[in-house]
């Protein structure tokens, strides 16, 4: 592969990019080291962390992160105001709620300030990168003699934006039974055996109405219902992480 200096797009891809290309070289120059990828997640729409693998740099380098939104009043990049560090080297940026626009294309630029030609621009759909908090306040109630209802709460995110994965099992089950619940933070189990002890847990994701996040939240704290008889082989039915 030959190296080639080209002038790149003026939209946001500031000029004089050094690229590797298989086309005939116009200007020969040493290829630059690729920058690490930036990965961003929006945590419960409260803050966003954009991180990179700083240890992939051959020398300790304080890379800088700038960002903007595709459609905004001020089309210029702004520098990260709250860097995250790993071994005293920048490895991420935390962006606060007031700077998060879920439904605008997020443009993020990582740059080596010592070598301005070492620069990578990525575009991200933030609505697909939301990770909710684990569901909270799981409560069980009897709808009838054998019917149970499980309810829970999610903080800061509209219920209609979330999809839930409910898992339950009894002390006689080797594996979880699981099902998807859309938008409604409740689930009913039509038939329970009062001689069994049941465990329930829930997690959520920002999908599919308001975004298409594939990332599930952490599991809720488990809740239990039913007989407190000693399990025959407790180790066999230990709660999985």
């Amino acid at each position: 592969w030959s190296s080639k200096v080209l002038m790149s797009s003026a939209n946001e891809d500031i000029k004089a990019d050094l690229i590797l290309t298989s086309t005939a070289p116009e200007h020969l120059s040493a290829p630059t080291l690729p920058l690490p990828e930036v990965q961003c997640f929006v945590f419960n729409i409260e803050y966003m962390n954009c991180t990179w693998n700083s240890s992939s740099e051959p020398q300790a380098t304080n890379l800088t992160l700038h960002y903007r939104y595709k459609v905004s009043d001020n089309n210029t990049f702004q520098e990260c105001s709250h860097y995250l560090f790993s071994k005293e080297i920048t490895s991420g940026c935390q962006i606060q709620k007031e700077d998060i626009q879920l439904y605008q294309t997020f443009v993020v630029q990582l740059q080596d300030p010592q070598k301005p030609q070492r620069r990578a621009v990525q575009k991200l759909n933030l609505q697909n990168l939301v990770i909710p908090r684990a569901p909270e306040n799981l409560t069980l109630s009897n709808l009838s003699e054998s019917q149970l209802e499980l309810r829970w709460k999610s903080r800061h995110i509209k219920e209609r934006c979330l999809q839930y994965l409910v898992q339950y099992r009894s002390n006689r089950d080797r594996s979880w039974t699981e099902l998807i619940v859309n938008h409604e933070p409740r689930f009913s189990l039509p038939s329970v055996d009062e001689l069994k002890r049941y465990t329930f847990r829930v997690r959520s994701r920002y999908n599919p109405i308001c975004g298409s996040s594939q990332q599930w939240s952490k599991w809720s704290q488990p809740v239990h219902w039913g007989s407190h008889t000693v399990e025959e082989n407790p180790s066999l039915f230990a709660l999985e992480a």
Epitope: W1, L6, S8, S9, N11, E12, D13, D17, L18, I19, L20, S22, T32, P34, L35, E37, V38, Q39, C40, V107, Q109, Q117, R119, A120, V121, Q122, K123, L124, N125, N128, L129
Partner: nanobody, 126 residues
Amino acid sequence: QVQLVESGGGLVQAGDSLRLSCVASGRTLSRCAMGWFRKAPGKEREYVAISSWGGDTFYEDSVEGRFTFSRDNAKNTVYLQMNSLRPEDTAVYYCAAAPTSFATTAYSSSNSYAYWGQGTQVTVSS
């Protein structure tokens, strides 16, 4: 070694359509960020459409709604469907690939792409 070969360019009238193809050999594109770029005479190279392997696709403002990026991993091929072509779309169109770790990585900076095709000429007459 990865080779990218573009095809599908040509001379068309304003308002017509073209479909560009880019076939890769040497490695799978299934875990690559992909980009279509163009270079018009006297202008800088600019991105036209970029895509992460997770499926997020972004377009340059002037082509949004007219151009569509797609990929067929089974054929190791990416496409650029160009509709309602305009004279200002005249350029050499390049396909580019960047192996990435994350499904969400889509690069609009040309220096982020490791592999490039030789380009295919698209000319739109008025």
